[in-house]
């Protein structure tokens, strides 16, 4: 039961995380105009990964896409790439984890296959979450650098009467959504990896088992090997020792080939 709960929760948390990563990637508020120096502006600027927007006090909002690819900063391109990689990996992870869920039966899929799929999706979620966190952090770092650069520029060359107030940008809502979503995906991935351990057959815990062959020699076969070559198909192998108490989750409705060594 605990394994199913862990796996299911990991799936749900990752699903929410990936939805958040997608939302953050699509959001326009990656950076928003800093109003510290001009709180009464009638024009409010904010920018996303794909377009920049201007919202007027009148309620009118105008957005313009970044129609150039080569003219954009390399850092922005890198952030875009990280977020897209995160989404793609997350989406594949979700697809894999659906089939890996213990509560879903697909034909006669074995526990080992489900365990492998759970581990694969878990790793994908972890990498997806890391990509999102990295992407958002790179963008945040870029904002901080530009913020202090524009602050320095604001106080230079102001000896004359005319002020050129440079627009400074600060963290937008999308950054926080991205950080939280990346964290959730990461946590979900870790939970999937933990669930995988519970799903995997506990063959490695089996002690060496002695078999009485019909011949005059005694054969020893460690339980860790799945292959049963060298034995006749009709040989009945007895499980002498089960390394741990089997949880309710691990009870099979029908015997699988991993129930016996």
């Amino acid at each position: 039961m605990a394994v199913t709960a862990c796996q299911g929760l990991g799936f749900v948390v990752s699903l929410i995380g990936i939805a958040g990563i997608i939302a953050a990637t699509c959001m326009d508020q990656w950076s928003t105009q800093d109003l510290y120096n001009n709180p009464v502006t009638a024009v409010f600027n904010y920018q996303g990964l794909w377009r920049s927007c201007v919202r007027e006090s009148s309620g009118f909002t105008e957005c313009r896409g970044y129609f150039t690819l080569l003219g954009l900063p390399a850092m922005l391109q890198a952030v875009r790439a990280l977020m897209i990689v995160g989404i793609v990996l997350g989406a594949i992870g979700l697809l894999v984890s659906i089939f890996a869920l213990k509560c879903i039966r697909i034909g006669s899929m074995e526990d080992s296959a489900k365990a492998n799929m759970t581990l694969t999706s878990g790793i994908m979620f972890i990498v997806s979450g890391l990509c999102a966190i990295a992407g958002v952090s790179v963008f945040a770092n870029m904002l901080v650098t530009n913020f202090w650069m524009s602050t320095a520029n604001m106080y230079t060359g102001m000896g004359g009467m005319v002020q050129t107030v440079q627009t400074r940008y600060t963290f937008g809502a999308a950054l926080f959504v991205g950080w939280v979503a990346g964290g959730l995906t990461l946590i979900g991935g870790v939970m999937m990896c933990i669930a995988c351990r519970g799903l995997a057959p506990e063959e490695t815990n089996y002690k060496a088992v002695s078999y009485h062959a019909s011949g005059h020699s005694v054969a020893y076969k460690p339980g860790g090997f799945k292959a049963s070559t060298g034995f006749g198909s009709n040989t009945k192998n007895k499980k002498i020792y089960d390394g741990g108490a089997r949880t309710e989750d691990e009870v099979q409705s029908y015997p699988s080939k991993h129930d016996y060594v």
Epitope: A42, V43, V54, G59, Q163, Q166, T167
Partner: antibody, heavy 116, light 113 residues
Framework: QVQLKESGPGLVAPSQSLSITCTVS????????VSWVRQPPGKGLEWLGV???????NYHSALISRLSISKDNSKSQVFLKLNSLQTDDTATYYC??????????WGQGTLVTVSA | DIVMTQSPSSLAMSVGQKVTMSCKSS????????????LAWYQQKPGQSPKLLVY???TRESGVPDRFIGSGSGTDFTLTISSVQAEDLADYFC?????????FGSGTKLEIK
């Protein structure tokens, strides 16, 4: 077509309050912003404040303590209230509206004289 | 507050002449995000309400004759009347609509000789 019409008292005694109503037609106050602008005789234009479509307001910093702008969307009316009037508040008061930040439509104005 | 300075305060021109009036702002009115200048020009004929001529520094309001041309960027702006007509006798005001309070210039009075 779009029309704005101001109605005011004409004469106000010093230290009293001024109330002017701007009645609009041809557009909805829920989507248009309405500003108040005044012009002292023979002088330039002075922006007083604005009420936006969503009901939010901005006031001129010099008048913020004694100016209030409100509206009634259902009656298509915008109200200006200016307290503690002085003689230098004598001016023609205009309401001006627009969908954006500039003033595309203007009322004909109402002359307010502050005098004892 | 952004201070708007207009010059000249008045000018007299003959019909058909080209008229140029200037407006300077104490801060840049150019929004870097959409590359638009938040400046408008108004015409006020004697005894009338002001009328919008130009917004975004160079976009003519519908119904405004094409002899009225707005130009400039940042802090320096110009309203040009390419061929002045008798009906252009009026006061012309520039106004910034970039930040509140929205401030007007003191105006330029155009007289016809």
């Amino acid at each position: 077509q779009v029309q704005l019409k101001e109605s005011g008292p004409g004469l106000v005694a010093p230290s009293q309050s001024l109330s002017i109503t701007c009645t609009v037609s041809g557009f909805s106050l829920t989507s248009y912003g309405v500003s108040w602008v005044r012009q002292p005789p023979g002088k330039g234009l002075e922006w007083l404040g604005v009420i936006w479509g969503d009901g939010s307001t901005n006031y001129h910093s010099a008048l913020i303590s004694r100016l209030s702008i409100s509206k009634d969307n259902s009656k298509s009316q915008v109200f200006l209230k200016l307290n503690s009037l002085q003689t230098d508040d004598t001016a023609t008061y205009y309401c001006a509206g627009g969908l954006r930040l500039w003033f595309a439509y203007w009322g004909q104005g109402t002359l307010v004289t502050v005098s004892a | 507050d952004i201070v708007m300075t207009q010059s000249p305060s008045s000018l007299a021109m003959s019909v058909g002449q080209k008229v140029t009036m200037s407006c300077k702002s104490s801060q840049s009115l150019l929004n870097s995000s959409n590359q638009k200048n938040y400046l408008a020009w108004y015409q006020q004929k004697p005894g009338q309400s002001p009328k919008l001529l130009v917004y975004f520094a160079s976009t003519r309001e519908s119904g405004v004759p094409d002899r009225f041309i707005g130009s400039g960027s940042g802090t320096d702006f110009t309203l040009t009347i390419s061929s002045v007509q008798a009906e252009d006798l009026a006061d012309y005001f520039c106004q910034q609509h970039y930040s509140t309070p929205f401030t007007f210039g003191s105006g330029t009075k155009l007289e016809i000789k």
